[in-house]
């Protein structure tokens, strides 16, 4: 399936040019998406090109400036948040990034009724997290690891927690491991639907070992960064969940929510909190050995002012073939009766599907089924359930949006997106207004991305929100590579791959091949999305063939493929990349003397192991910020897939699966090892240990470190990185500069 047909006729060929590395580094061909900031069923806010915050009313078709760019600029605001009663806006400035999601900022409150900033009882700075209540204009915020509450922006704050301490106790915000590996948010507090209660997590990191690394900066002495970071098998954070009545916060104070007995009997995690009503809350817990998850529905007891979680409202989800859930355990979407819910989990055939749970998980009613997977439930209304899946035409790397009518029996299913712009759009997400009155569809490709607005009742397209016309025009004279997504059938395993081919690709010629790999559990690289990136350049200008392969351990193709890597990381992922390369060679257009592999993070681990596989297939390869031993990586992530590094559990495979154990095998390949010294995620330690093992084995290799850079290698480091890797590959493939 050629997704980007060549638009070129010979007569036009002279005006066409190849992509340059500069194009990629400058972001010349980046695209825009449009996600409405919904504030009601028919209204949304959006920041205009000139930085005004504009309200759009879909029904009237009219726009209104609610906050001028001058007001934004007066405090150098980079973000904003409207209070639900529309009386105030918070303006966020002095953004300072911490980890993947977390950052601190300064917040100003602007009064929309008088057009002035709120003076008196101003917020402290910097704030770690701030949010409005879902109704009215109460404020909850986290400052110095403690939670504060304001009934109105101008009021003095009420301090909810007092034990917060840097790197020790975190209230309302996650510690490092919960942020990165469990919650995937910067916050750990949740308002009840009408703002009556505020739930929050407390993380106690007192006993967690600390990772320490130097931050060189500009001073005479480097700083030491200390992060409580539990590596595999180490002591984990202790989590507790509390709920406070925000109307009378001083009355009984925060009340702890009990942990289900079957969870509390050994080490455990809190995985998510979902409010159902103002007086009903749903908590999800997970055993440290992550194959048992418990969903617990708790009710407020007015007489005792406590939260009660009856055993009859505990729902257990267990995996016998792997870990619970996909990457995370899915969260429930409650229906209007406030007790039954919809949830995605594996069916009896091992495919993740939507189930409706009314009383017990055992009696769950399966809503979707087939040899494909339901991926996300977007919205449940009185009569419809909107979800995404990769069902259409059996391409796992696609995403379409479906509507199931739950108001009628039997429920009927309709694909909302499958035939909208079939060639251009095969990978969608959606954003819904209140009660799904309207929704935005964001199409990511394979063609140029486009965002559209739709009527939630009829699915009719109302207008185009963003169609990337400038990008389309800019690409008219660019020789883009061709892309195809196909599959290989090998030993009862389906290996989907994406191949990126040079613009004038000729099957009778031989091309150098670069494998780009990630390959982590529950990931997917072969997706029908648009991208003009470094590998596009390598195909367009340098004439390389690039391939991405989804092997065992990857997602959305059923549990057999997903859980194949359980307790055995570093084996099948590598095998499947090698198998695919052999198949590509058989296709006849690959120069088997010029094959390389590269990857970042988990991909750096896989590329390193592939290079050290001893197959002789790879001439060279690059590992950026690789994991080198699972003993060095975070407990929550690592143990999910590997169990514990103990003798009576899985220590043997922890030891066997290191990159260092294969140091000798790097002798016959050209290896480029790259890492940021301030990587809080995959610590520089990983590459330091690879380098040490290679030196000890007297194996020559190339390396590059990026001082004070984290796992993302951003800013000027990005330019240096891709320039450096380009030179390395061109040299490896004997391509002239």
């Amino acid at each position: 399936i050629v997704l980007r047909p060549s638009r070129v006729h010979n007569s036009e060929e002279n005006t066409m040019r190849a992509l340059t590395l500069k194009d990629i580094l400058n972001g010349t061909f980046s695209y825009k998406t449009f996600f409405p900031n919904w504030i009601s069923g028919q209204e949304y806010l959006h920041q205009s090109a000139d930085n005004n915050i504009v309200l759009y009313n879909i029904e009237t078709g009219q726009s209104y400036t609610i906050l001028s760019n001058r007001t934004m600029k007066s405090v150098n605001a980079s973000n904003y948040g409207l209070s639900p009663d529309r009386q105030f806006v918070y303006l966020e400035s002095d953004y300072s990034k911490l980890w993947r999601y977390s950052y601190t900022a300064t917040y100003y409150i602007y009064d929309l009724s008088n057009g002035e900033f709120v003076r008196g009882n101003e917020l402290p700075r910097p704030i770690q997290y701030l949010c409005w209540s879902p109704v009215g204009s109460k404020l909850a915020y986290v400052y110095q690891n403690n939670i504060y509450l304001k009934q109105r922006p101008g009021d003095p704050p009420f301090q909810i927690t007092f034990n917060g301490r840097e790197n020790k106790i975190f209230n309302g915000i996650p510690d490092w491991v919960y942020e990165e590996e469990m919650l995937a948010t910067k916050y750990a507090l949740w308002w009840s639907p009408n703002g009556k209660f505020l739930a929050y997590a407390e993380f106690n990191d007192t006993d967690i070992p600390v990772i320490a690394y130097s931050y060189y900066g500009d001073e005479q002495y480097p700083r030491t960064i200390n992060i409580p970071y539990p590596k595999a098998g180490a002591k984990n954070p202790v989590v507790r969940i509390f709920i406070i009545d925000t109307t009378y916060p001083a009355y009984v104070g925060p009340q702890e929510v009990p942990v289900p007995a079957m969870i509390a009997s050994s080490d455990y995690y809190f995985s998510w909190l979902t409010w159902v009503t103002d007086e009903r809350v749903c908590l999800q817990w997970l055993k440290r050995v992550q194959n048992v998850s418990v969903l617990s529905i708790c009710d407020f007891r007015e007489d005792w002012q406590t939260w009660d979680c009856p055993k009859t409202q505990e729902h257990i989800e267990e995996s016998r073939t792997g870990w619970a859930g996909g990457f995370f355990v899915s969260t429930p979407v409650f229906s209007y009766d406030a007790i039954s819910y919809y949830k995605i989990f594996s069916d009896k055939d091992g495919y993740k599907h939507i189930h409706y749970i009314k009383d017990t998980v055992e009696n769950a009613i399966q809503i979707t089924s087939g040899k494909w997977e339901a991926i996300n439930i977007f919205r449940v209304t009185q009569d419809s359930l909107f979800y995404s899946s990769n069902e259409f035409e059996e391409y796992p790397g696609r995403r379409n949006i479906y509507r199931i009518s739950i108001g009628s029996y039997p429920p009927s299913k309709k694909c909302v997106t499958c035939h909208l712009r079939k060639e251009r759009c095969q990978y969608y997400t959606a954003s819904f207004s209140d009660y799904a009155k309207y929704y935005a569809l964001v199409c990511y490709g394979p063609g140029i991305p486009i965002s559209t607005l739709h009527d939630g009742r009829t699915d009719q397209e109302i207008k185009i929100l963003e169609e990337n016309k400038e990008l389309e025009n800019a690409l008219k004279n660019i020789q883009l590579p061709k892309e195809e997504i196909k599959k290989l059938e090998v030993d009862e395993i389906t290996l989907w791959y994406k191949m990126i081919l040079p613009p004038q690709f000729d099957r009778s010629k031989k091309y150098p091949l670069l494998i780009q790999v990630y390959g982590g559990p529950c990931s997917q690289s072969v997706r029908s999305v648009f991208a003009v990136n470094w590998i596009s350049y390598l195909a367009s200008k340098e004439g390389m063939v690039i391939a991405l392969v989804d092997g065992r351990g990857t997602a959305f193709q059923g549990d057999k493929l997903l859980y194949a890597v359980y307790r055995k990381l570093g084996v099948y992922e590598v095998e499947d990349q090698i198998t695919a390369v052999r198949k590509f060679i058989e296709m006849g257009f690959i120069d088997e003397k010029r094959i390389a592999i590269w990857g970042w993070s988990y991909g750096g681990y896989v590329s390193s192991l592939a290079l050290a596989s001893g197959t002789g297939l790879f001439k060279c390869g690059i590992a950026v910020a690789p994991v080198s031993s699972w003993e060095y990586y975070a407990s929550v992530y690592t143990e999910r897939f590997m169990g514990l590094p103990t003798k009576d559990d899985n220590l043997e495979h922890y030891k066997n699966s290191t990159v260092m154990a294969r140091a000798e095998y790097f002798r016959n390949v050209d290896y480029l090892l790259i890492h940021g010294t301030a990587d809080d995620n995959v610590h520089f330690q990983n590459s330091a240990q690879i380098a040490k093992a290679l030196v000890n084995a007297q194996v020559d290799f190339q390396a590059m470190w990026y001082s004070d850079q984290n796992h993302g290698l951003s800013g000027l480091s990005t330019n240096h990185l891709y320039t450096h890797m380009t030179h390395f590959l061109k040299q490896c493939f004997s391509l002239s500069d």
Epitope: S40, G41, Q42, S48, N52, V54, L55, E59, T60, G61, Q62, S63, Y64, T65, I66, S68, R70, L82, P84, D85, R86, L112, S113, G115, V135, D434, Y435
Partner: antibody, heavy 119, light 111 residues
Framework: EVLLQQSGPELVKPGASVKIACKAS????????MDWVRQSHGKSLEWIGD????????IYNQKFKGKATLTIDKSSSTAYMDLRSLTSEDTAVYYC????????????WGQGTSVTVSS | DIVLTQSPVSLAVSLGQRATISCRAS??????????INWFQQKPGQPPKLLIY???NRGSGVPARFSGSGSGTDFSLNIHPMEEDDTAMYFC?????????FGGGTNLEIK
């Protein structure tokens, strides 16, 4: 101080047209929409329409479509309303009002322009 | 169009007492938790002045003796304590749906 200064009274013949001006001061014209309202003698108020100054986008009361046309001149911070094909029914006081979109409220009003249609 | 019916048409209240004006909409003007009902005061020869917006929020410089309440289709304006300066016409107005419409007005005077 927010001020909406409207043009003076008009006496016109049936079938004629009239253009009422509304000069905004004390705030930036493009920060708020401008709405127009009419009040016939001894009667209640009727909403005519709304204009978004940044793009000139308008919405009208169906009743006034073809009767009223709203425009903006950003350079002079002035909003205009054209009324055409006037009849005695159009005799009224016409107000321009600053419209605070986030609250859907007309928070400041001009002093009004009296239009009398008589032969 | 949404029709707003005000009652009473006229009202006389003693100084210091409470004045209550009602406004009933022909259909709900609730919008996802908010009600876009506004109240205006108009004195002879003057333009209307915004008193209350969004059902219950006082406009700029409006004294605390003016308050608004209601939801769905039934809304009211309360003035307490009544002062001499409050003699005027009062209009309710909805901006939940185009065309925005006004009530017929209530004439408030001192008893």
């Amino acid at each position: 101080e927010v001020l909406l200064q409207q043009s003076g009274p008009e006496l016109v013949k049936p079938g004629a047209s009239v253009k009422i001006a509304c000069k905004a001061s004390g705030y930036t014209l493009t920060d708020y929409n401008m709405d127009w309202v009419r009040q016939s003698h001894g009667k209640s108020l009727e909403w005519i329409g709304d204009i978004y100054p940044n793009t000139g986008g308008t919405i009208y009361n169906q009743k006034f479509k073809g009767k009223a046309t709203l425009t903006i001149d950003k350079s002079s911070s002035t909003a205009y309303m054209d009324l055409r094909s006037l009849t005695s029914e159009d005799t009224a006081v016409y107000y321009c009002t600053r419209f605070r979109g986030i609250h859907y409220a007309m928070d400041y009003w001009g002093q009004g322009t009296s239009v009398t249609v008589s032969s | 169009d949404i029709v707003l019916t005000q009652s009473p048409v006229s009202l006389a209240v003693s100084l210091g007492q409470r004045a209550t004006i009602s406004c009933r909409a022909s259909e709900s003007v609730d919008n996802y938790g908010l009600s876009f009902i506004n109240w205006f005061q108009q004195k002879p020869g003057q333009p209307p002045k915004l008193l209350i917006y969004g059902t219950s929020n006082r406009g700029s410089g409006v004294p605390a003796r003016f308050s608004g309440s209601g939801s769905g289709t039934d809304f009211s304006l309360n003035i307490h304590p009544m002062e001499e300066d409050d003699t005027a016409m009062y209009f309710c107005q909805q901006s939940n749906e185009v065309p925005y419409t006004f009530g017929g007005g209530t004439n408030l005077e001192i008893k």
